[in-house]
């Protein structure tokens, strides 16, 4: 199978997940594909602790995460429930702003310079964070 027992080379391990922090920019879909080629996904933030960990690594730079509403409701790329899950939007966000003049609204979420989230045009070339979970079976205690 494709289950992982250790992180890919140059990825950062944290709390049984592996993270890749880019230093270049891509559109949201292209960043997502970069992650998927490693059988990973754009980062899914499920707790304040994970938010702080990611924020520490990316610094004050706009960075894509695995959250979008391109098909209507907001969805996490790994199926994590959005409505009941962790959220860290900036005040008055998301706003699906149309005033940018690029056509359409804003359907993809990113970390802003202070770590809080904003929705923006998915074609903007922002940095990105990939995440992949380590083999859950390896978390089981050994049989005695």
């Amino acid at each position: 199978g494709s289950e992982r027992t250790c992180c890919p080379v140059n990825w950062v391990e944290h709390e049984r997940s592996c993270y890749w922090f880019s230093r270049s920019g891509k559109a949201w879909a292209d960043a997502d594909n970069y992650c998927r080629l490693e059988d990973a996904h754009l980062v899914v933030v499920t707790s304040w602790e994970e938010q702080k960990f990611v924020q520490h690594h990316i610094g004050p730079v706009n960075t894509w995460m695995g959250l979008h509403d391109q098909n209507g409701p907001w969805k996490w790329v790994d199926g994590t429930d959005y409505e009941t899950g962790f959220k860290n939007w900036r005040p008055e966000q998301p706003d699906d702003w149309y005033g940018h003049g690029l056509g359409g609204g804003e359907d993809c979420a990113h970390f802003t310079d202070d770590g809080r989230w904003n929705d923006d045009v998915c074609q903007r070339p922002y940095r990105w964070v990939c995440e992949t979970e380590l083999d859950k079976a390896s978390q089981e205690p050994p049989l005695l």
Epitope: S2, N10, S22, S24, K26, A27, D39, P125
Partner: antibody, heavy 121, light 107 residues
Framework: EVQLLESGGGLVQPGGSLRLSCAAS????????MSWVRQAPGKGLEWVSA????????YYADSVKGRFTISRDNSKNTLYLQMNSLRAEDTAVYYC??????????????WGQGTMVTVSS | DIQMTQSPSSLSASVGDRVTITCRAS??????LNWYQQKPGKAPKLLIF???SLQSGIPSRFSGSGSGTDFTLTISSLQPEDFATYYC?????????FGQGTKVEIK
């Protein structure tokens, strides 16, 4: 030595099928996404398909979508391309290529020698 | 899809010449641009990745530059073994696409 070796090419009639294989050696095959790239006689290079490290995600050029299927067997260090409903315009040398990763950047850093597929009646 | 356009499609040059090949993308690809060399009957070989980074084992007479939509491959002093076809390729977005190639021939 890092090496990719394709096989399975040949002459096939339009509408027929063929399965290409690519045997990898000299590197940790399961750590790299892989691709197929083709080159029609006297023409340029065309990316055909890609597959993620563990095989969970696949990508296709529009020209082959629905007809070709990429797969891999990491236990055998082998990449495959199942080609169905073949057309004359699929005639080409087919190369398998390793996706080298250089930080955020990627490129086809290792190529096989290619296998010729001819679709003709 | 991102279209890649190379120019010229062919050129004639002599050993020792400085050769420049250009590649233009239909939209910005920042520096997600690779260059390959292909000799007749052989597989392509990676020369340059990330627009300007020299692949291991490639002679330093090869160099790449550019960002956004316009890129250049330069061979500072053409050697006999450099007569080949050169391709650019964008790795910004799937489907990955190649330029149509530039054939470097002996004058």
């Amino acid at each position: 030595e890092v090496q990719l070796l394709e096989s399975g090419g040949g002459l096939v009639q339009p509408g027929g099928s063929l399965r290409l294989s690519c045997a990898a050696s000299g590197f940790t095959f399961s750590s790299y996404a892989m691709s197929w790239v083709r080159q029609a006689p006297g023409k340029g290079l065309e990316w055909v398909s890609a597959i993620s490290t563990g095989g969970g995600n696949t990508y296709y050029a529009d020209s082959v979508k629905g007809r070709f299927t990429i797969s891999r067997d990491n236990s055998k260090n082998t990449l495959y391309l199942q080609m169905n409903s073949l057309r004359a315009e699929d005639t080409a040398v087919y190369y398998c290529a390793k996706r080298g990763v250089y930080g955020d950047f990627d490129a086809f850093d290792i190529w096989g020698q290619g296998t010729m597929v001819t679709v003709s009646s | 899809d991102i279209q890649m356009t190379q120019s010229p499609s062919s050129l004639s040059a002599s050993v020792g010449d400085r050769v420049t090949i250009t590649c233009r993308a239909s939209q910005s690809i920042t520096n997600f641009l690779n260059w390959y060399q292909q000799k007749p009957g052989k597989a392509p070989k990676l020369l340059i990745f990330a627009a300007s980074s020299l692949q291991s084992g490639i002679p330093s007479r090869f160099s790449g530059s550019g960002s956004g939509t316009d890129f250049t491959l330069t061979i500072s002093s053409l050697q006999p073994e450099d007569f080949a076809t050169y391709y650019c390729q964008q790795s910004y977005s799937i489907p990955w696409t190649f330029g149509q190639g530039t054939k470097v021939e002996i004058k």
